[in-house]
């Protein structure tokens, strides 16, 4: 604005105004006049850049008139008043009402004085992210799927995650004329390391105060990978029992959990009981190789393990695990 | 053809007072701004008031308030200024002039030949 | 109120460029001051030529513009001719209202 004291009138008025599909808005301007200063203001006009004729004029004498009398209206422009105000609204936006406009106030003895202004048509996008759920395929495929539907602008998508992986973005039109959906994939190579964990879709948007997370839970299906724990090398005869746990780990769930040796069946001294094999003491020593052998929906897998069980003091060792 | 007729001059005498019209045509009267302008013999003018013949709304030297009242007759397209309490310091030239605009500005755009007032007793 | 003060005569041959000016007792003119310039020819007949500074009436010549020269309004004829000699006034707006120079008498010899 002119700095204060130089006398002359001028039209405020944001540069951009905001609005969205389907709503109304207003479009702000007002006439500054510096104190002291007299002026007379005759004539509000509104125009649309590149179109002839004036969509919306306030007269001093004569009041309103518009181009389409259902969608305009002054706010504040009354009959008998001062005319400082000239803001308009606009109902039922459509994206064809994007464009520059002129608010011009037509005053005297200064002259005509008008402004610029931006109308920007937004749509809020409605966003969403789901998981999408893979097998290890070796290569990479898309895991988790973003959608921004409907915006104006285009949303942008982004993602972040500790585990790499690759976006892949499209868009294509929206359901409203004018909008546009974008939708977004996180490409990875699937890997049982990846299942259960999280990756982030962020979305910006104009129509946002902050961009919008949305957290997706991975899914891998994956066969068991399987491992025996609870052996440390020293069981020795005469201890009490010990306990074998067969750990898997696989998408879905294991459904069953078969012990057995390389020799075949188990001996006397193990017992099965489920994802445990239960080892009794033993009064001689054995050198046996056991198999842990695990299922799910997607295939078996097995662990082996040899365990040995040697003579000497069980008081000097503490490997074993007791009951 | 737009014009600015006035009406003819006046001998009147001090302490009277005197109504001058101004009779417009070949433009829109109702929005129009239309000026009151002074002029002594040899001497360069000086402004009175403006009035928007749409609504009646006035601005005026200070220096003439209270002695120049200026209105108009919308039905007639006539706008007219009454000077009272006159005194011989207001025999005067008297325009009518009609403001047009350029868009950006405004300028004296159409005058009327003027109405001479003669204060004697 | 304010003065505004013109040169009272000037004089100039056909074809020269001349520039009338305008200054004002308050201080520099500026482009709130809406600068006005109207012409007075013999029995009174005047014409409008610039409004608000710069901006030329309709059907006025080329030669006549209206600009801001230092801290005064100026009204610049390009190319004079025999027909521009007259009265020259300026009026400047303060506020709420305008207030005239005394003019300046052209001559174009």
């Known amino acids: 604005w002119p700095p204060p004291g130089t006398g002359d009138v001028v039209v405020q008025a944001p540069t951009q105004v905001p609005g969205f599909l389907g709503d109304s808005v207003t479009l702000p301007c007002y006439l500054q006049v510096p104190n002291m200063e007299v002026t007379h203001v005759s004539q509000l006009t509104w125009a649309r850049h590149g179109e002839s004729g004036s969509m919306a004029v306030f007269h001093q004498t004569q009041g309103p008139s518009y181009s389409e009398s259902k969608r305009l209206e002054f706010v504040a422009a009354r009959l008998g008043a001062e005319l400082r105000n000239a803001s308009l609204r606009m109902f039922g936006l459509r994206v064809e009402d994007e464009g520059n406009y002129t608010c011009l106030f037509v005053t005297f003895p200064q002259g005509s004085r008008s402004v610029d202004i931006w109308l920007r048509v937004l749509a809020k996008p409605q966003n969403t992210a789901e998981v999408q759920k893979v097998q290890l395929t070796g290569e990479p495929v898309p895991m988790a799927r973003c959608v921004s539907t409907g915006g104006r602008p285009p949303a942008q998508i982004t993602w972040h995650s500790d585990l790499g992986g690759m976006p892949n973005t499209s868009q294509v039109p929206g359901f409203l004329s004018g909008t546009v959906t974008v939708t977004s994939l996180w490409i990875l190579v699937p890997s049982s390391q990846v299942d259960g964990k999280n990756v982030t879709c962020k979305v910006e948007h104009e129509s946002f105060e902050k961009p919008q997370l949305l957290t997706v839970n991975l899914t891998v299906y994956y066969p068991p990978e399987v491992s025996i724990s609870g052996y440390d090398n020293n069981w020795y005869l005469g201890q009490n029992e010990a306990t074998l746990t067969c750990d898997a780990r696989s998408n879905p769930e294991p459904t069953g959990y078969n012990w057995s040796t390389t020799m075949g069946p188990l001996p006397p001294f193990a017992v099965a009981q489920g994802a445990q094999l239960l080892i009794r003491p033993v009064d001689k020593p054995i050198n046996t190789t056991l198999i842990c052998n695990v299922t799910n929906a997607l295939g078996a897998r097995q662990a082996e393990l040899t365990v040995q069980v040697k003579e000497g003091p069980p008081s000097e060792h503490s490997g074993i695990s007791r009951n | 053809q737009v014009q600015m007729q006035q009406s003819g001059a006046e001998l009147v005498k001090p302490g009277a007072s005197v109504k001058l019209s101004c009779k417009t045509s070949g433009f829109t009267f109702s929005s129009s701004y239309i000026s009151w302008l002074k002029q002594k013999p040899g001497q360069s003018l000086e402004w009175i008031a403006w009035i928007y013949a749409g609504t009646g709304d006035t601005n005026y030297n200070q220096k003439f308030t209270g002695k120049a009242q200026v209105t108009v007759d919308t039905s007639s397209s006539t706008a007219y200024m009454q000077f009272s309490s006159l005194t011989t310091e207001d025999s005067a030239i008297y325009y009518c002039?009609?403001?047009?605009?350029?868009?950006?500005?405004?300028?004296?755009?159409?005058w009327g030949a003027g109405t001479t007032v003669t204060v004697s007793s | 109120q304010a003065v505004v003060t013109q040169e009272s005569a000037l004089t100039t041959s056909p074809g020269e460029t001349v520039t009338l000016t305008c200054r004002s007792s308050?201080?520099?003119?500026?482009?709130?001051?809406?600068a006005n310039w109207v012409q007075e020819k013999p029995d009174h007949l005047f014409t409008g030529l610039i409004g608000?500074?710069?901006n030329r009436a309709p059907g006025v010549p080329a030669r006549f513009s209206g600009s801001l020269i230092g801290d005064k309004a100026a009204l610049t004829i390009t190319g004079a001719q025999t027909e521009d000699e007259a009265i020259y006034f300026c009026?400047?707006?303060?506020?709420?209202?305008?207030?005239f120079g005394g003019g300046t008498k052209l001559t174009v010899l």
């Open positions: 608000g500074t710069n």
């Open positions: 308050t201080g520099a003119v500026t482009t709130s001051n809406y």
């Open positions: 009026a400047l707006w303060y506020s709420n209202h305008f207030v």
């Open positions: 002039v009609r403001h047009g605009s350029t868009g950006r500005g405004w300028y004296f755009a159409v």
